[in-house]
């Protein structure tokens, strides 16, 4: 429980959160992620916007890039070369999709304090990075990859076939960026910079989504994106590796695809360098329940990459799809052949396994009715990972160390008891060889970032403790938050409830369900946040609940894979079940219950409103999916299979929002979407609106011109104001 403060320490009066507090970001917290440059050195941007160097062991610190230098080219980001001779300064940031953006890059010589003018980089660049050693540069410009041996050298062009919306080299196309790689890049340097691996995506045959971008001109522009919807033609991917020492000699060499993968449609899912001459590629069948990890070796004599069948490791799911949201990536040992990987154990929980020869002989090194979530680092004697084991709360993240050296394997929770009440949700950032690490705590109390010794785990210093925020919140009445569980028919439904500051169990309160509910998501987390729903609980006296139902993550495969091939059924049922349980608690006004969600949450909230239960008075869907035939192939087919008659077309048709249009008659529905949504296309809401109109069902709607899936900026303020008015009207709360 997070206590509500009704009086500050001096006994003065306090105030509730306001909508303006939320819209203006008055109560935002800070985190501190060191930009590690060695085992004991890191860079960080100071409050004055200088880039400052820190040495943990000597205590030395100095500015390596002044704010003035950054400002001289309007830079908003930087990257230091590993040899510390140069830095790139990034300016003219122009967002594209979720991760991708273009920018202008200036190379600054740290030795003489001057910008390099010889062979300047073209603009705008789609991606740029230093080699892991020295100061070679690889970059992508107009869908082609270029290499510079030194920043002042002329570039060597690696690929020539790049074409906008057709062939992508070194960067992903839309679907790979959003649904597979989750990065803006698709090129990878080998550990010492000898080789450069890259992906080529051929989108020639992919159908194009086209939508208007209204802008300020007389005629709107049309945005065209090759975007494979469920069942459509997919990108064709190839992986190449080039020797960067003598790139002109042999040129790029293609890495072969495992035969069992190449026999039908497939995806490339990730690339991990093991050594300069060994690389690990992961592939996935289009029907995403079979993944193959392939370890490939460089053959000097032939200048080719060889991927022996004996080094192919198959991961297959018989109960759902392979992996969690993504197939996990391997973390290799120092022997450069064995590795650690998270996958389902025989009880259906995701755990860390050690694979030495075959997956069948894998040694399971974590086990229990909880899940290992991330492997942060493996050293000679330790493995650091996060899990939700501690005290059986799935929404926690603690950091553990397994000792793997010359003594018996032992497991220690590094974070569980550090700041037990304040911190139960951590991530970590490790320096080279895990000599030091930063722990970043996200809650449930105020976030705090600390620096630790990698051998003793001793705290060295606090990096950021959000003191100003703590002081600012002293006179704010925050909602009480509790995380509990409901046991219903052999299913555990974890929920987070936010209660108004002066909550009285004998009174009746309106209830708002905030839902996401997508496969492998988690909403009930022990994290600190002050957002729109905090305001609704604090100022408007609304009880807020978030529920993790079937399909959500980190509680085992039974819960996760329950929704396999049946999206839109159990997620909705479980929200409804939870609402009924909340009503039984006695403090909910059952005539004032609402549900809202964004994206997948908009889909679930729409289906819940149209469930015919009579539980919900009103609800809001922001940027909802309305039919799985409209959404991206990689995501949709992972969970639903193909929209074909001999696969799962029937459920594709049964699970649309439009099919339930009639059921919206007895609820108040607010439908919201950005017209320039590249992700969940405006088409989804257009089809809901059309079905409601055709059924002569009244509803409210709002579109946001030229806004994407996030509806940011001024539109965001308008959106939350609009939703607030709608909810207050629904709950009969005075404005």
């Amino acid at each position: 429980l997070r206590p509500s403060r009704v009086h500050d320490s001096e006994g003065g009066t306090t105030r509730a959160l306001t909508l303006e507090d939320i819209l203006n970001g008055t109560f935002t917290y800070k985190t501190f992620f060191p930009n590690w440059i060695s085992g004991q050195e890191y860079l960080h941007q100071s409050t004055d916007n200088d880039i400052v160097y820190y040495n943990i062991e000597t205590g030395e610190s100095y500015t390596i890039l002044s704010n003035a230098t950054m400002k001289s080219v309007n830079a908003s980001n930087y990257g230091l070369s590993p040899d510390r001779q140069f830095a790139y300064l990034e300016s003219d940031y122009s967002k594209l999709w979720r991760y991708s953006y273009t920018a202008t890059y200036h190379i600054y010589n740290l030795n003489n304090g001057e910008f390099i003018r010889r062979n300047e980089l073209p603009r705008p660049i789609q991606y740029l990075c230093w080699s892991p050693v020295g100061s070679k540069l690889a970059y992508v410009y107009q869908n082609n990859i270029y290499l510079k041996q030194r920043p002042e050298d002329p570039p060597f062009q690696i690929t020539y076939n790049g074409r906008e919306n057709k062939i992508f080299n070194g960067i992903p196309d839309w679907v790979y960026e959003e649904e597979m790689l989750a990065t803006k890049h698709a090129l990878w340097w080998s550990p010492n910079g000898k080789f450069l691996a890259y992906a080529e995506f051929n989108d020639t045959e992919i159908p194009v989504i086209a939508y208007s971008y209204y802008g300020d001109e007389q005629y709107p522009r049309t945005i065209n994106i090759p975007y494979p919807k469920a069942g459509a033609k997919n990108p064709v991917v190839r992986i190449f590796i080039i020797d960067t020492t003598y790139p002109q000699q042999t040129g790029p060499r293609e890495v072969p695809v495992p035969a069992m993968i190449a026999s039908s449609d497939y995806y490339f899912s990730w690339l991990t360098w093991v050594t300069d001459e060994r690389v690990c590629l992961q592939w996935l069948k289009r029907i995403q329940n079979v993944s193959v990890l392939s370890i490939c070796d460089f053959r000097e004599g032939w200048q080719t990459w060889d991927c022996p069948k004996a080094q192919e490791h198959i991961e297959e799911s018989r109960t759902g799809w392979a992996g969690g949201f993504f197939v996990s990536t391997p973390v290799f040992s120092y022997d450069a052949i064995s590795y650690y990987k998270i996958f389902s154990d025989k009880d259906g929980y995701k755990h860390i396994h050690y694979i030495k020869d075959t997956v069948e002989n894998a040694i399971q090194i974590t086990s229990g009715k909880w899940e290992a979530i991330n492997i942060f680092r493996v050293t000679q004697d330790s493995l650091f990972y996060s899990s939700n084991e501690f005290e059986d709360y799935p929404g926690r993240r603690n950091i553990y160390r397994i000792s793997i050296g010359s003594s018996p394997p032992s497991k220690k929770c590094i974070t569980c008891h550090l700041r037990k009440e304040r911190c139960q949700y951590y991530t970590a950032s490790f320096s080279d060889y895990a000599k030091y690490y930063a722990l970043i705590c996200y809650g449930p109390g105020l976030p705090i970032s600390t620096l630790h010794d990698g051998h003793t785990d001793q705290e060295i210093k606090i990096l950021e403790e959000n003191k100003e925020l703590e002081n600012a919140l002293k006179n704010i009445q925050l909602p009480k938050e509790e995380i509990k569980k409901l046991e219903v028919d052999d299913i555990t439904l974890w929920y987070k409830m936010m209660l108004p500051p002066r909550f009285d169990r004998s009174k009746k309160y309106p209830l708002l369900i905030q839902v996401y509910g997508g496969p492998c998501s988690q909403s009930v987390k022990s994290v600190f946040s002050i957002n729109w729903i905090s305001y609704l609980a604090s100022k408007e006296g609304i009880v807020i609940a978030l529920v993790d139902g079937r399909g959500t993550a980190y509680q085992g495969d039974k819960l996760l894979y329950a929704v396999y091939r049946k999206l839109g059924v159990y997620e909705v049922e479980d929200q409804i079940t939870a609402v009924r349980k909340f009503i039984e608690m006695g403090f909910i006004d059952e005539k004032r219950i609402a549900i809202w969600g964004w994206s997948y949450g908009g889909y679930v909230s729409s289906l819940a409103l149209a469930s015919g239960t009579g539980l919900f008075k009103c609800g809001i869907a922001v940027a909802p999916v309305s039919s799985w035939e409209y959404y991206a192939s990689i995501y949709t087919e992972r969970f639903m299979g193909l929209p074909t008659k001999n696969d799962n077309l029937e459920h594709y048709k049964n699970s649309t929002v439009m099919a339930r249009a009639e059921y919206f008659r007895n609820v108040d529905y607010l439908l919201i979407h950005g017209t320039a949504d590249d992700n969940v296309h405006f088409q989804n809401s257009a089809q809901i609106a059309k079905a409601l109109v055709n059924a002569q069902v009244d509803f409210q709607a709002m579109w946001y011109s030229d806004q994407n899936h996030g509806i940011p900026g001024l539109s965001s303020k308008h959106l939350y104001t609009r939703m607030t008015h709608f909810l207050k009207q629904c709950f009969s709360l005075s404005d």
């Epitope: 064995s338 154990d345 030495k356 040694i363 399971q364 090194i365 086990s367 394997p409 032992s410």
Partner: antibody, heavy 121, light 107 residues
Framework: QVQLQQPGAELVKPGASVKLSCKAS????????LHWVKQRPGQGLEWIGE????????NFSEKFEIKATLTVDSSSNTAFMQLSRLTSEDSAVYYC??????????????WGAGTTVTVSS | QIVLTQSPALMSASPGEKVTMTCTAS?????MYWYQQKPRSSPKPWIF???NLASGVPARFSGRGSGTSFSLTISSMEAEDAATYYC??????????FGSGTKLEIK
């Protein structure tokens, strides 16, 4: 194949000492640590101690620190445990066992057949 | 030192029956190991690192648990499974401690 050979039985008088042997075959004794385990008739397993044959380092359970002495003769690929000042409480089967300490194993993979020590006057 | 308590001390099961025995540690341990011992024989490694089967152990056996509570399960009892099973742990080593054993008989 890998084996640990132990003599079947030893009959000793109270107050005397006995030196039990454990001969390794199929591998070099210095490659793995050797542990000794006691089992009284109808009872459970009790760890006595271990020796690292490569350097002679050893660890004991507190209870056996005075009672047991562990040595290795690498030339004969044999480990020894000497038990001193024997009493009827020391009557038991004594096993030598090899520790597989390869990554993430850490279990006793090879066991001798055990030597039954009977302390009786 | 950490004390391991096994329960039950003695149990019997019919062929095909599911069998579960437990091992409780007096304080939290990282991993549990199990050994099988038949009369007049040396112990054999059975389960290591809580949940991994040693070489040659039938797949009907499984191990699980964490903290202070661990178990060994046989999904479908067979005659050859009749034996005494010992749990063992390394936390706080030295010393190593074993449980007192669970004797499993066939009905």
């Amino acid at each position: 194949q890998v084996q640990l050979q132990q003599p079947g039985a030893e009959l000793v008088k109270p107050g005397a000492s006995v030196k039990l042997s454990c001969k390794a075959s199929g591998y070099t004794i210095t490659s793995y640590s050797l542990h000794w385990v006691k089992q009284r008739p109808g009872q459970g397993l009790e760890w006595i101690g271990e020796i690292n044959p490569a350097n002679g380092d050893h660890n004991f359970s507190e209870k056996f620190e005075i009672k047991a002495t562990l040595t290795v003769d690498s030339s004969s690929n044999t480990a020894f445990m000497q038990l001193s000042r024997l009493t009827s409480e020391d009557s038991a089967v004594y096993y030598c066992t090899r520790l597989d300490d390869s990554r993430f194993h850490w279990y006793f993979d090879v066991w001798g057949a055990g030597t039954t020590v009977t302390v009786s006057s | 030192q950490i004390v391991l308590t096994q329960s039950p001390a003695l149990m019997s099961a019919s062929p095909g029956e599911k069998v579960t025995m437990t091992c409780t540690a007096s304080s939290s341990v990282s991993y549990m190991y199990w050994y099988q011992q038949k009369p007049r024989s040396s112990p054999k490694p059975w389960i290591f690192l809580t949940s991994n089967l040693a070489s040659g152990v039938p797949a009907r056996f499984s191990g699980r648990g964490s903290g202070t509570s661990f178990s060994l399960t046989i999904s479908s009892m067979e005659a050859e499974d009749a034996a005494t099973y010992y749990c063992q742990q390394w936390s706080g080593y030295p010393p190593i401690t074993f449980g007192s054993g669970t004797k499993l008989e066939i009905k």
